[in-house]
C-alpha cells in the first residue's frame, strides 16, 4: 500500500498554511491551517504544539489539555468557559490559543 | 525521565489493593499514563489509561475490575476485588500517541490464600 | 476490538544470521504499530514505533515494515544479546492490544 503524491499517512497532519501578525506591542497572533488524515475516532487537533490526529472525544469535551496540546514542560491550563488553552513555559511566558 | 511502581504484594482473594506510580524527570500533566500487566510466563495485557484531565478508558476485560486515578505526582491503579487470575507484574508507562516509551520496573502483586 | 497474531511464537536462531517475526492484525491498523523487546525480570523496551522508525538507542540492525494488516520485524546480523521476547502492539485505537510474543533464543 504505497501512498500518492500528496497524500498523508493515516494518523499524521501537515502544516499547508501559517500566518503570523506582529503589529500589536508584546503581542504575536499566529494562525495556522493544517491538513491531516484521521484514523476512525481521530479529529484534527494540536499535540506538543504541532499539528495532530487526537481522540475525537477530546474535542467534544473540550478538555483541550487531553490532547496534550503544549511542549514537554509547560503547564497546560483550560481558558474560562473552555474557549481555548493557555501553556505555560518555565520561565512564566503564556502563550495562549483559542478554539474557534 | 523514570517511572516506579510501589505496593504490590501478597493479599488474599476479595481483598482490594492499590498501586502507585510515581515520575521522576518529567510531569504527569504532560503525558497520557497507562497500567499494563504481565501474569508470570505470560503475555503483556494493558490495563488502561488515564488522561490529564482525569477521564480514564479500559480494556474490556478490566472494567469494573481496576480503577486507575491520579495526583498531581503519581497514577494509582485500585484493584477492586483480587482473584488468583490477577496474579502479575504490574507496570506503569507513558505514552503520548500511543506507544509506551517509557516503562517502570513493575510490582509484583501475587492473589492467594 | 483487534486482534494482534504474532508467529512464530518461538525460534532459535544463529549469531550473524536473520531473524524475522511477523504481527498480523485482524483490521487495518494504519501503520500503528510498535515493537517491544523483554528480557527476563524486566520491563519491555520500545524497539520500533509507527511500523517502522527506530527509537534513539537501537541498533540498526533492529527494522519493521509493513502495512495494512500485515507487519514484520527484522533483526539483521542477529546477536547474543538479542536473546529476549518480543512483542508487537497496535495502537490505532483502544483498547491498545499487545500480540502474543515470540521467544527468540540465540545459539
Known amino acids: 500500500q504505497f501512498l500518492k503524491e500528496g497524500q498523508l499517512a493515516a494518523g499524521t497532519c501537515e502544516v499547508i498554511a501559517a500566518h503570523r501578525d506582529s503589529s500589536q506591542p508584546r503581542r504575536t497572533i499566529a494562525r495556522q491551517t493544517a491538513r491531516c488524515a484521521c484514523r476512525k475516532g481521530q479529529i484534527a487537533g494540536t499535540t506538543r504544539a504541532r499539528p495532530a490526529c487526537v481522540d475525537a472525544r477530546i474535542i467534544k469535551t473540550k478538555q483541550w489539555c487531553d490532547m496534550l496540546p503544549c511542549l514537554e514542560g509547560e503547564g497546560c491550563d483550560l481558558l474560562i468557559n473552555r474557549s481555548g488553552w493557555t501553556c505555560t513555559q518555565p520561565g512564566g511566558r503564556i502563550k495562549t490559543t483559542t478554539v474557534s | 525521565q523514570s517511572l516506579e511502581e510501589s505496593g504490590g504484594r501478597l493479599v488474599t482473594p476479595g481483598t482490594p489493593l492499590t498501586l502507585t506510580c510515581t515520575a521522576s524527570g518529567f510531569s504527569l500533566s504532560s503525558y497520557y499514563m497507562n497500567w499494563v500487566r504481565q501474569a508470570p510466563g505470560k503475555g503483556l495485557e494493558w490495563i488502561g489509561i488515564i488522561y490529564p484531565s482525569g477521564t480514564t478508558y479500559y480494556a474490556g476485560w478490566a472494567k469494573g475490575r481496576f480503577t486507575i486515578s491520579k495526583t498531581s505526582t503519581t497514577v494509582d491503579l485500585k484493584i477492586t476485588s483480587p482473584t488468583s487470575e490477577d496474579t502479575a507484574t504490574y507496570f506503569c508507562a507513558r505514552t503520548v500517541s500511543g506507544y509506551f516509551d517509557i516503562w517502570g520496573p513493575g510490582t509484583l502483586v501475587t492473589v492467594s490464600l | 476490538e483487534l486482534d494482534l497474531t504474532q508467529t512464530p511464537p518461538s525460534l532459535s536462531a544463529s549469531v550473524g544470521g536473520t531473524v524475522t517475526i511477523n504481527c498480523l492484525a485482524s483490521e487495518d491498523i494504519y501503520s500503528a504499530l510498535a515493537w517491544y523487546q523483554q528480557k527476563p525480570g524486566k520491563p519491555p523496551t520500545l524497539l520500533i514505533s509507527?511500523?517502522?522508525n527506530l527509537e534513539s538507542g537501537v541498533p540498526p540492525r533492529f527494522s519493521g515494515s509493513g502495512s495494512g494488516t500485515d507487519y514484520t520485524l527484522t533483526i539483521g546480523g542477529v546477536q547474543a544479546e538479542d536473546a529476549a521476547t518480543y512483542f508487537c502492539q497496535g495502537y490505532s485505537s483502544y483498547p491498545l492490544t499487545f500480540g502474543a510474543g515470540t521467544n527468540v533464543e540465540i545459539k
Open positions: 509507527g511500523t517502522s
